[in-house]
Every structure is written in C-alpha cells, then in structure tokens.
C-alpha cells in the first residue's frame, strides 16, 4: 500500500460536524441550565475547581504528551479536540444516565466538573495511540471510552452504593488498561520508519516537562472535586499535596540512582511527578495524617521510576508503545497501587476495630476495580477493532508520529 | 445558637407557585449542605431535596423533580425553595435541616458519616382550590 | 428506587423496659443510615448516624446496630421522654437520594 499520507478530508469533516450537529440537537432537546440564583462567592469558589481541571485537561495533559520530536503539534491540538468533543458528550451521558427520568438534564457547574474528568480519562488512554491514529479515529475513541466510564460510573454505583469521588477515581486504572487495549489491537510502528520520530526532543520535551508542571500543580484539585463536604476536600487536598510534594523528590532522586552515571531521565520525571497524586487518589480524604500521604507518595515515585525503566522495552514490543509514552503503563500500575492502598487501609482499620464486615468490604472493593479493568479491557478492545476498519483513512505505519500528515507547514525546516 | 428558621408558607391554589426561605444562624452555613424534608398531616417525613455546601450540587426526590428548585445565598445565610406547579399532594409542613458531615477518626483512616443534625420548627404549606 | 421497611407499625413497651425496632432496606446501603426521634408537634431529632454512632447529646440508652440491609434501633431501658415516632433514614451515593422509612411509633403499654 502507498506510503503517502491518506487524506482524511471527506472523512473527518463530515464525521465531526455531524457528531456535533447531533450533539446541538440533544442539548436543544434535552437540556437546561439550573435555574436558581446562588451565592456570587459560592459560584465562582465552585467554578475554580472545574478551571482548574479544565487547565489540567488541556494544559497539563496536552503538553505532557507533546514530548516527541516530530509529533508535538498533533499531540497538544488533537488533545483539546477530544477534550472538547468528551465534555459536551459526558455532559449529555451522565445527565442520561442519573438524571433522565424527570425529563430534562439540569446542566450545573458541578455537571462540568464532572464531565470534564470524564474527558480526561481519554486524554490519558490516549498517550498509548497518538500518533497511530488520525482524529476521525479519535473521535470514536472519545465517544467509546466517555461512554463506557459513564457507564461503568453507574453500575458501580448502582451496585456497590459508592459515590461520585469513589467510582470516578477508576478512572486512573480504567484509562490507562483501556488505552493499552487499544494499542494492542492497532498496527506496529514500521521499525525502519519511525525511528527518528517517536525519540523526544529538547523544546518538545521542555513542553511535556511543562505539562507535568500544570498536572502536578492542580492535582489536588483533582483529587477533590467531587468531594461532598469541607472537611473531606480539606483532607484531599492537603494529602495530595504531600504524596505529589514527595514524589517529586523520589522521582528526581529515583532518576538518578537508575542511571549508571547518575543522570537524570526527563522520561522519568515527566511521569513520576505525578505518581503520588495518582496513588492517592482514592482514599486521599481517608487518609488521617500527612506522614502516611508522603510514604505513599515515596513508593508511588519508586514505583513509577521503576516502571519507566523496566517496562517501556516490554511495551514497546508488545504495543507498539513508543519509549516516551509512558502513561499507560505508569497510571496502571499507579492505578492499582492507589487501589491497593484503599483496601489496605480498609482492612488494617477494620481490623483494628474488630467489626465482621471486613471481609464483606474487602471483596465489594476487589469487585469495584475487578469490573473496572474488565470494562475497561473489554470496551477498549472494542475500540481498538473499530479504529481498525478502513473507513477511517488510519494513517500507514510509515507515517506514525509524524506533524506532517495532518498540518500545514508553511516552510518544513529540517529537525521541525 | 445553631438555629434554622422556615418561612414562606401558606395556603395556595394548585398549579401555582410559592417560595420557601430558611435562615441559618449560629454556625458557619457556607460550611454545610442543606435540605428540605416535608411530612404531610398524620403522615411520615419525606425528604425534598439536598444542596452541596458551595452551591454546586442538587438532588431531588422523584416526586418534586422538575417542578421545585432548591438553593442557596451563603452571603445571606438563606437556603431557599422554589416550589412550581404545585400539587394537593404537596400539602406538608415543610422542614429545612442542615446535613451533617461527620469525620470519625480510625487508626489508619478517616470515616465520614452523614446525617440531619439540626432542623428547624416548619412551615405549613397548603396547596388547596 | 432504595424502599426502607420498618417495623414493627406500633411497638407498645412499658417504661423501664427494653425496646428493639427495625429497619430494613431493599438493598445494601452500607453504613449509611441514621435513626431520628419525632414528638408530635416537633421537629424530627437525629439519634445515630453511621448505623450505630450516637449524635452528640444523645444517652448512652440508645444504640444503633447493623450494617448492608438489616438495622436495628435499640432503646435499652425506656423513659418516659422515649415514647414518640422513630425513622430510619437511607442515604443513596448514586443518584443522591434520601428515604426515610415509614416510621414506628413507641407508645407506653
């Protein structure tokens, strides 16, 4: 087959304006705004939070994922694109799935808040694909994974009675097992032909570096938005600040000790930051005292750096997942270390009280993550056989990674 | 003292509107969600609705959704709720009462319960032609 | 839709004794229940929270026990202030909802 880049130009314009032609309709039809006057204070107190994630979505993971060398523009621009697209459609599903029986969707700013960590569950499935795929395949993706984590948020719910801060904090392990299942199912990189385009480069790699930056600075906002009262966002807040505070430390430190001449990996530090806010995202308002934060945060950081250096290789034969992506792999095992730490210290306290349930409460919490990577696998491979059929124009394995297969360059420098 | 105060009531024909205020005193109210419980004469409490302590959140009973809205002015201490289309079967004294998030303290985790701590005295409504 | 059951409708105990009510869901609401006294013409007053923590105020006569779907409300040595109506109340994560059982009203024997 032809090694010239296939024109997505019938196929993306059409796709995405009729996606959100339908996506007007459903919000003329089916939705309103709240209509009560609240507190000024109060609405911009509760706007920064969804500000905040919004910065994180677009600015923090969008850069965090431009680190390589001929692939950085697509990285950013199609990031917002699917954040864009999964905020309107998360909007519409989860108002669907909680709300529709009374007739219309009410659109709050909590309605947003949500929405928009929906959307970002994509943005870090996505870290496995970019740059194998176009943005009409995206666009699926989007619409897939948005609607299998809407749905998985529910039943889990429905089932195991947890709320919104509990079951939306699968999102680290559902992301990242669905964006690999996905990368499983596309075609390898040509070995020959991608060499010189998934290696990082320096001002590409300071923007990932300053993707991280944004990521770590907001992830306590993350890590309590959905929370229901002060006290729990307080706790949040303040624990994620230590476990992302130390694994920074452990990361840099980590970095250094793994290499032979004691140099620091920017690959590491762009993901290991970050480890602690992920580790402790679901028992972040449960957890009682900074030290316990900032061990977490220790392990997350040895964790992820140890990741980083064993398991790209591994990866990258098995997934066709460049050396540089390393999100999926680390928010896996993140992901399930934050897990791990739930039950933990569910059973270390059940126990210490005594009560007979601990048993009970053990296996609901194994049956929660055990239904997320299943959805997650599951959904993701549905995903990865879709973008697979020929209707999408998928650009050739030759032409992985590479800006130039849906930009305008006005001048093509040589090292672009 | 912590205190919560429901005014508004009175008789109103059906298909009309009424709005019901709460004013909180004694406690940081910015602090805390808010509900709205109602018990019809010679019948049991239903509850009506719940705001989130910053305004971000509502949830409603099936029986009102649609037709009333709760909220908030933290600036003013008042929680508010706007009751449209009302119904005979809307009848009730109608209670506002501040949701209790309480943190219990375990050896290696934190333990939030929720409750209805403090209610105020009611407000009659009668929805009558 | 979470249906709370009390029961018994109507419990008659005489004072001093020990009375036992219950409360029963339709499915598992965890631990997120709580107990609250009503006297006629007052406001609801809230016992336990958590299943079986006494809010603050309350004696040490009242206890709260259970957890999933079956829960119980024991008064260990009834006085005289004791008698009037008790709900038990759910607290769904997922949509937000609150049901209030029926309510069982405690009458002097």
């Known amino acids: 087959s032809s090694k010239y880049p296939r024109s997505v130009r019938r196929c993306l314009p059409l796709w995405a304006l009729t996606l959100e032609a339908a996506l007007i309709l459903l919000f003329y039809f089916f939705t309103h705004y709240d209509a009560s006057l609240e507190d000024q204070k109060g609405l911009v107190a509760s706007y920064q939070v969804g500000q905040d994630l919004t910065v994180m979505a677009a600015i923090g993971l969008g850069f965090l994922t431009s680190s390589f060398r001929r692939h950085s523009w697509s990285s950013v621009a199609f990031n917002l694109f699917m954040l864009a697209l999964g905020v309107q459609w998360a909007i519409l599903l989860d108002g669907f799935l909680s709300q529709f029986p009374s007739g219309k969707v009410v659109i709050t700013l909590f309605s947003i808040r949500l929405a928009t960590m929906s959307a970002l569950s994509v943005l870090i499935s996505v870290d496995a694909v970019l740059g194998k795929v176009n943005l009409a395949q995206l666009v699926v993706m989007v619409l897939v994974e948005v609607t299998a984590l809407g749905n998985l948020r529910m039943v889990i719910s429905n089932i195991f009675n947890t709320d919104y801060h509990m079951n939306m904090m699968h999102i680290y392990v559902f992301a990242a097992y669905f964006g690999l299942s996905v990368a499983w199912c596309l075609p390898k990189p040509l070995p020959e032909g991608t060499e010189d385009k998934d290696q990082t480069a320096t001002i590409p790699s300071l923007s990932a570096m300053l993707g991280a930056l944004f990521l770590w600075m907001f992830w306590p906002s993350f890590n309590s938005a959905l929370l229901r009262s002060p006290i729990e966002r307080k706790n949040a807040v303040f624990n994620t600040y230590y476990a992302v505070a130390v694994s920074v430390v452990t990361a840099i430190s980590g970095s250094s000790l793994a290499h032979p001449q004691g140099k620091i990996s920017k690959t590491y530090v762009h993901s290991a930051v970050l480890a602690g806010g992920v580790a402790v995202g679901t028992s972040c308002h449960l957890i009682p005292s900074p030290w316990l934060a900032m061990v977490l945060g220790l392990v997350a950081g040895l964790i992820s750096v140890g990741g980083a250096k064993y398991l790209p290789g591994c990866c990258n034969r098995v997934l066709g997942i460049p050396h540089s992506s390393i999100m999926g792999y680390n928010f896996s095992l993140l992901g399930l270390l934050g897990e791990i730490i739930y039950i933990v210290l569910l059973v270390l306290d059940t126990v210490g009280a005594g009560n007979g349930m601990i048993g009970f409460q053990v296996l609901l919490s194994i049956g929660e993550l055990s239904l997320a990577i299943v959805i997650a696998l599951m959904s993701g491979l549905l995903t990865g056989l879709l973008l697979n059929l020929k209707i999408w124009k998928a650009p050739h394995e030759a032409k992985y990674f590479d800006d130039q297969v849906f930009w305008k360059f006005p001048h093509l420098a040589v090292g672009f | 003292q912590v205190q919560l105060v429901e005014s508004g009531g009175g008789v109103v024909q059906p298909g009309r509107s009424l709005r019901l205020s709460c004013a909180a005193s004694?406690?940081?109210?910015?602090?805390?969600?808010m509900h709205w419980v109602r018990q019809a004469p010679g019948k049991g409490l239903e509850w009506v609705a719940v705001?989130?302590?910053?305004?971000?959140?509502?949830y409603y009973a099936d029986s009102v959704k649609g037709r009333f809205t709760i909220s908030r002015d933290n600036s003013k201490n008042t929680l508010y709720l706007q009751m449209n289309s009302l119904r005979a079967e809307d009848t009730a004294v109608y209670y506002c009462?501040?949701?209790?998030?309480?943190?219990?303290?375990?050896?290696?985790?934190?333990?939030?319960?929720?409750?209805?701590?403090?209610w105020g005295k009611g407000t009659t409504v009668t929805v009558s032609s | 839709e979470i249906v709370m059951t009390q029961s018994p409708a109507t419990l008659s105990v005489s004072p001093g004794e020990r009375a036992t009510l219950s409360c029963r869901a339709s499915q598992s609401v965890s631990s997120n229940l709580a107990w609250y006294q009503q006297k006629p013409g007052q406001a609801p007053r809230l016992l336990i929270y958590?299943?079986?923590t006494r809010a603050t105020g309350i004696p040490a006569r009242f206890s709260g026990s259970g957890s999933g779907t079956e829960f119980t409300l024991t008064i260990s040595s009834l006085q005289s202030e004791d008698f009037a109506v008790y709900y038990c109340q759910q607290y769904n994560n997922w949509p937000t909802l609150y049901t209030f059982g029926q309510g069982t009203k405690l009458e002097i024997k």
């Open positions: 958590g299943a079986s």
């Open positions: 009462a501040r949701d209790m998030v309480t943190m219990v303290r375990g050896a290696y985790r934190n333990y939030y319960y929720y409750g209805m701590d403090v």
């Open positions: 004694g406690f940081t109210f910015s602090s805390y969600g």
């Open positions: 705001i989130w302590y910053d305004g971000s959140n509502k």
